[in-house]
């Protein structure tokens, strides 16, 4: 598994609702701080 890059990956609240989340992907931790980070390459955007 790749290291989780808090700077580069971003997440949107699942339950907030479209008008409240405004489709924004906030650069915050996943909801559970000890949870494994996603491993899909397409969800890891490395800052150049």
């Amino acid at each position: 598994m790749e290291d989780f890059n808090m700077e580069s990956d971003s997440f949107e609240d699942f339950w907030k609702g479209e008008d409240l989340s405004n489709y924004s992907y906030s650069s915050t931790l996943p909801p559970f701080l000890l949870d494994a980070a996603p491993c899909e390459p397409e969800s890891l955007e490395i800052n150049k």
Partner: antibody
């Protein structure tokens, strides 16, 4: 692996209240909403509302406003849902759920459910 | 009239492709909503499968195989869950949901039976 672990089944009298807990086992609640969803026997899910564990802010479904209270205790990574003035038609399995989405994937977490039976 | 309407039941054979529909009430345009799809098996909580608004705004659930996909039928004002290569383990209830008027609204569900 993080899990949402809920409190056990409850049997309540009409007019009373029930408080269901939802603990993040193996992780810490963060800023993403925890929703409460109930499901009566043989029926589809029904959303009750959510709480932001970080701020404590809530958003209740109109149907439950005035009867539901959602709280959290971040020190023990636990969210609570209290439903008052119970009626027989509140008999249902109550779930807590949370999750987040990246641009390509969504990750959802559900508790195992708590059966609340309202009967005289 | 319900906000979301789903056929109550559907049956198909293993290996087939099936389309489950979620029709939005008249006046609610499917193109404006992300349609969420859940699978639920007896005794378990719903499991998120995917959400679909357009080909550029879609997300798959974690661990959900690609044979589950979403689309929409604008002429029918409906969201569609397509399951290809149907398997016996796909037998379950399927629910759609949308965020509408500041609340989550679920459809009544479709019971999918895998024959044989």
């Amino acid at each position: 692996q993080v899990q949402l672990v809920q409190s056990g089944a409850e049997v309540k009298k009409p007019g009373s209240s029930v408080k269901v807990s939802c603990k993040a086992s193996g992780g810490t609640l963060s800023s993403y909403a925890i929703s409460w969803v109930r499901q009566a026997p043989g029926q589809g899910p029904e959303w009750m509302g959510w709480i932001n564990p970080n701020s404590g802010g809530t958003n209740y479904a109109q149907k439950f406003q005035g009867r539901v209270t959602m709280t959290r205790d971040t020190s023990i990574s636990t969210a609570y849902m209290e439903l008052s003035r119970l009626r027989p038609d509140d008999t249902a399995v109550y779930y807590c759920a949370s999750g987040y989405c990246s641009r390509s994937r969504c990750y959802d977490y559900w508790g195992q459910g708590t059966l609340v039976t309202v009967s005289s | 009239q319900a906000v979301l309407t789903q056929p109550s039941s559907l049956s198909a054979s293993p290996g087939a492709s099936v389309s489950l529909t979620c029709t939005l009430r008249s006046g609610i345009n499917v193109g404006a909503y992300r349609i969420y799809w859940y699978q639920q098996k007896p005794g378990s909580p719903p499991q998120f499968l995917l959400r679909y608004k357009s080909d550029s705004d879609k997300q798959q659930g974690s661990g959900v195989p690609s044979r589950f996909s979403g689309s929409r039928d604008a002429s029918a004002n409906a969201g569609i869950l397509l399951i290809s290569g149907l398997r016996s383990e796909d037998e379950a209830d399927y629910y759609c949901a949308i965020w509408h008027s500041s609340a989550w609204v679920f459809g009544g569900g479709t019971q999918l039976t895998v024959l044989g």
